[in-house]
C-alpha cells in the first residue's frame, strides 16, 4: 500500500472552496521531489491538474494552489469556487503521476440545500455584522415590517416595526426602514451567533398582498489560518475584525487545554509575563485593524491563537474573532544567538544579531522594547548611521561579522540599560530577535580614563588597560561616530600596574593623537577583539582646549576626571512607535545626532593581534 | 472542557453491522475533527477513521483495513459523529475510542485529539 496518506472523501457545496491536506513520509527525496494533484479519467489515466513545479491547468486558473510543506511531509491542494462539475475521482502524489507514490480521493461538490426560489444568501463570520434587505411594494410602505426565523415548519417573529425585539437578539439588532420614496427596509444584526444560523423571512405588510422575501444567514466559524514559524524568529498576527469594533478594545488570546483562551496581550495594558520583552501590539488602523508581532519564538509557543475585541479585551461569544494555529519549526534557518547577555556597571556589551544572510544590503537596526500600555520599540541606532541622542558616544551598529551577522555595541553600561532589545532589519520580517541586557555585579576588564582634556597643537596619549585574559585579543582605539567607529593607529605599550595579578601578561594598548587638532573632539573607544568578532569596550571622551602650557599630555587614570553627562533626549525625539517596526523607513524620521567628524590624525604603531574567548559580556 | 460519551457498542455475529454514536458537550472553540480509535486487547490503539470540518465542507480519513466497510458520519446539530460498521469482521473486536480536538495535522496521529471518550466495547463473534 501506498504510505502516502490524505482525505478518502471530501465534500462541499457550490461556490466553496477546500483544502486537501496531504501527507507523506518526509524522507529527504520525499521533501524534494514534485508533488501533483490530479483527476482520474474514465481511460484510467490521471491529468495533472496542479503541481509543486508551478503547473496550473487551465480549468484552475486562478482558483488552486498547492502548497509543500516539506518539514512536515505534508503537501496542501487548496481550491476554490468549486462547481458541481469538479466532483470526481483525484489523487494527490510525489513523482510520476503514473507511477509514483499516490492517494485516492473522492470529491463531492453538491447543489447545496434546497431553497425557496429567491432567495439572498448571506455568508458571515461569527461575531460580524449582517444587514439583510427587505424590499417592499408602495401600498405596503405603512404597514408593519418584519423579520421572522423559520424554525422548521413554524415562523418565530425576531424583530418588527412596532418596537419588539426577541429576546435571543436583544442589544444587537435594529430595523432601519428609510426615508419616503425608498422601497426596501434593512435588518441589521451585529455579534452574530452560530445560533443565528438559519432562514429568514421578511414581510412588510399582512393578507394576501404581503410582501415575502428569504434570506439564508449562513454564520461560520472562522477555520484557523495555519502559521509555520522558525525557532527563534517571528510572527505576526494581522486582525482585521471590521468598522463595527473599531473603537472596542482589542485582544490576542491563545487557547489552552480547558477550550477557554488566555490573554497574551490586550489593548488595556494586560501582557503574559511568558511574553515580556518580546511582544508588541502595534497601533490600530482607522478601520480598527492591528497587528501583535512576537519575536524570539520558542517551541512552547505553539498553539492556537485568537484575535478579537470585546470591551472587557477578553474572548466573549457572539463577538468578532480572527484564528491562527501556530507551528513553531525546529529545524530553524535562524542560528542560536545569546538570549541574555550580561554586562557591569561602566562595562559594555556586544551583541550579534541575526539577519537573513540573503539580505545583507538590508537595512539594520536596535530598538529598545519597552512595555508600557501595548509595548513599543523606540529605535535606537540604525546602519545607516543614525543614532537617538542619550546614546551618543556609547553606541553603534557594526556590520560586522556579516554574512547573517551583525553586531551592536553598547558601552558606558547603567542599571537603566537592563532589559529587552530588538534586532531587526527592513527586510525579512521573520528575522526579527531580541535579547535581554542584564548588569550584574564586577568591574569592567578594560580601564581609560573617564575624561580627557587635550591641548590644541600638543600630543596627546591615552592609556587603556586590559588584564592578561585578553593578552591574545586584537586591540584597537577607534574614534566614535553616528556613523560607526573609525579605527585609529595604536601603540602596545608592554606591561601595566593596573592589574596587580596579572603580572607581565597584563598589558596597556596607547592612542595617540599628535598633533591635537579641533577635529580630534570626541569620543574615543579602546576595545579587544578576534576577527571580526567584537567582545569588550572602553569609552573616553576628549575635550580639546586652546594651548595653555607647553609639552605634551600623557593622562593616567589616577588624573581622569568623571566622564561629561550624557545630553538628555531632547523632547522633540519622536518616539518611533510600534507601526515604525512593519515599515522600518519610518524611523528615518528619529532625530539625527550630528556627525563628530573625520577620523583624527595620529601615528600608527603595533597592534596586538589576538584571539577572543568571549563575545558581549564584561565579566564571565 | 469538552466531554464525549459513547454508545452503540455490543456483541454481534461476523458480517452484521453496528453504529456507534459519539456525542459531543461543552465548549469547543477548538473542535474541526472528530474521528475514532480501537484498541484490541493487549495491542495499541489504532486509527480507525476521523471527520474534519470547516463550514460546510467535509473531510473523512479512513484505516486501509476499514475502507470500504465503515463510514463516518456527523450531525452538526446535535454534535454527534456516526461510525456505521459493516461487514464486521472477528479482528474489529475492540474498546472504541471517540476523539476529538483541532486535528490540523496528521488525523491518524493520537496527539491531534484533545479529548478522549471512555470507550465501547464492539466484539465480533465468528
Known amino acids: 500500500k501506498s504510505p502516502v496518506f490524505g482525505p478518502q472523501e471530501v465534500s462541499s457545496v457550490e461556490g466553496n472552496s477546500v483544502s486537501i491536506k496531504c501527507y507523506y513520509p518526509p524522507t529527504s527525496v520525499n521533501r524534494h521531489t514534485r508533488k501533483y494533484w490530479c483527476r482520474k479519467g474514465a481511460s484510467g489515466r490521471c491529468i495533472t491538474l496542479v503541481s509543486s513545479e508551478g503547473y496550473v491547468s487551465s480549468n484552475y486558473a486562478g482558483r488552486a494552489n498547492l502548497t509543500n510543506f516539506p518539514e512536515n511531509g505534508t503537501f496542501v491542494v487548496n481550491i476554490a469556487q468549486l462547481s458541481r462539475d469538479d466532483s470526481g475521482h483525484y489523487k494527490c502524489g510525489l513523482g510520476i503521476n503514473s507511477r509514483g507514490l499516490s492517494f485516492d480521493v473522492s470529491l463531492e461538490v453538491s447543489q447545496g440545500p434546497e431553497l425557496p426560489n429567491g432567495t439572498e444568501v448571506y455568508t458571515v463570520d461569527v461575531g460580524r455584522t449582517v444587514t439583510i434587505k427587505c424590499p417592499f411594494k408602495t401600498e405596503n410602505a405603512p404597514k408593519t415590517k418584519a423579520l421572522y426565523k423559520k424554525i422548521g415548519q413554524t415562523s418565530v417573529l425576531v424583530i418588527d416595526s412596532r418596537n419588539y425585539v426577541n429576546p435571543n437578539y436583544k442589544d444587537r439588532i435594529r430595523l432601519r426602514i428609510p426615508g419616503t420614496g425608498q422601497l426596501i427596509f434593512t435588518v441589521v444584526i451585529d455579534r452574530l451567533r452560530l445560533s443565528d444560523h438559519g432562514l429568514y423571512l421578511c414581510q412588510a405588510g399582512d393578507g394576501s398582498n404581503r410582501d415575502e422575501k428569504n434570506a439564508d444567514l449562513q454564520v461560520l466559524e472562522p477555520e484557523p489560518e495555519l502559521v509555520y514559524e522558525d525557532l527563534r524568529g517571528s510572527v505576526t498576527f494581522h486582525c482585521a475584525l471590521g468598522l463595527e469594533v473599531a473603537n472596542v478594545a482589542k485582544f490576542l488570546c491563545r487557547v489552552n487545554s480547558r477550550e477557554t483562551c488566555d490573554v497574551v496581550i490586550n489593548t488595556l495594558g494586560k501582557r503574559d509575563s511568558a511574553f515580556e520583552g518580546r511582544i508588541l501590539l502595534n497601533p490600530q488602523d482607522k478601520d480598527g485593524s492591528f497587528s501583535v508581532v512576537i519575536t524570539g519564538l520558542r517551541k512552547e509557543d505553539e498553539g492556537r491563537y485568537l484575535c478579537g475585541a470585546h470591551s472587557d479585551g477578553q474572548l466573549q461569544e457572539g463577538w468578532p474573532i480572527q484564528a491562527w494555529q501556530l507551528f513553531v519549526n525546529e529545524e530553524s534557518t535562524i542560528p542560536r544567538s545569546p538570549t541574555v547577555v550580561k554586562g557591569v556597571a561602566g562595562g559594555s556589551v556586544a551583541v550579534l544579531c541575526p539577519y537573513n544572510p540573503k539580505e545583507s544590503q538590508s537595512l539594520k537596526y536596535w530598538c529598545l522594547w519597552e512595555g508600557a500600555q501595548n509595548g513599543r520599540c523606540p529605535l535606537l541606532v540604525e546602519s545607516q548611521g543614525l543614532v537617538q541622542e542619550q546614546y551618543e558616544g556609547r553606541l553603534s551598529l557594526l556590520q560586522e561579522p556579516g554574512n547573517g551577522t551583525f553586531t551592536v555595541i553598547l558601552n558606558q553600561l547603567t542599571t537603566q540599560d537592563a532589559g529587552f532589545y530588538w534586532c531587526l532589519t527592513n527586510g525579512d520580517t521573520r528575522w526579527r530577535t531580541t535579547v535581554e541586557i542584564k548588569i550584574i555585579e564586577g568591574e569592567p576588564n578594560l580601564k581609560v580614563p573617564g575624561n580627557v582634556t587635550a591641548v590644541l597643537g600638543e600630543t596627546l596619549n591615552i592609556p587603556c588597560h586590559f588584564p592578561c585574559k585578553f593578552s591574545s585579543y586584537e586591540k584597537y582605539w577607534c574614534k566614535w561616530s553616528n556613523t560607526g567607529c573609525q579605527t585609529l593607529p595604536s601603540q602596545d605599550e608592554g606591561p601595566s600596574e593596573a592589574f596587580v595579578n596579572c603580572d607581565e601578561n597584563s598589558r596597556l594598548v596607547s592612542l595617540t593623537l599628535n598633533p591635537v587638532t579641533r577635529a580630534d573632539e570626541g569620543w574615543y573607544w579602546c576595545g579587544v577583539k578576534q576577527g571580526h568578532f567584537y567582545g569588550e569596550t572602553a569609552a573616553v571622551y576628549v575635550a580639546v582646549e586652546e594651548k595653555k602650557v607647553a609639552g605634551s599630555r600623557y593622562v593616567s587614570p589616577a588624573k581622569a576626571d568623571a566622564a561629561p553627562d550624557e545630553k538628555v533626549l531632547d523632547s522633540g525625539v519622536r518616539e518611533i512607535e510600534n507601526k515604525a517596526i512593519q515599515d522600518p523607513r519610518l524611523f528615518a524620521e528619529e532625530k539625527v545626532v550630528a556627525d563628530t567628524g573625520d577620523q583624527a590624525g595620529g601615528s600608527r604603531a603595533s597592534v596586538d593581534s589576538s584571539s577572543s574567548e568571549e563575545q558581549g559580556g564584561s565579566s564571565k | 472542557e469538552v466531554q464525549l460519551v459513547e454508545s452503540g457498542g455490543g456483541l454481534v455475529q461476523a458480517g452484521d453491522s453496528l453504529r456507534l454514536s459519539c456525542a459531543a458537550s461543552g465548549r469547543t472553540l477548538t473542535t474541526y475533527g472528530m474521528g475514532w480509535f480501537r484498541q484490541a486487547p493487549g495491542k495499541e490503539r489504532e486509527f480507525v477513521a476521523t471527520i474534519k470540518w470547516s463550514g460546510s465542507t467535509n473531510y473523512k480519513y479512513y484505516a486501509d483495513s476499514v475502507k470500504g466497510r465503515f463510514t463516518i458520519s456527523r450531525d452538526n446539530a446535535k454534535n454527534t459523529v456516526y461510525l456505521q460498521m459493516n461487514s464486521l469482521k472477528p479482528e474489529d473486536t475492540a474498546v472504541y475510542y471517540c476523539?476529538?480536538?483541532?486535528?490540523?495535522?496528521?488525523?491518524?496521529?493520537?496527539?491531534?485529539?484533545?479529548?478522549w471518550g471512555q470507550g465501547t466495547l464492539v466484539t465480533v463473534s465468528s
Open positions: 476523539a476529538a480536538g483541532t486535528v490540523l495535522g496528521d488525523p491518524r496521529v493520537l496527539n491531534e485529539y484533545d479529548y
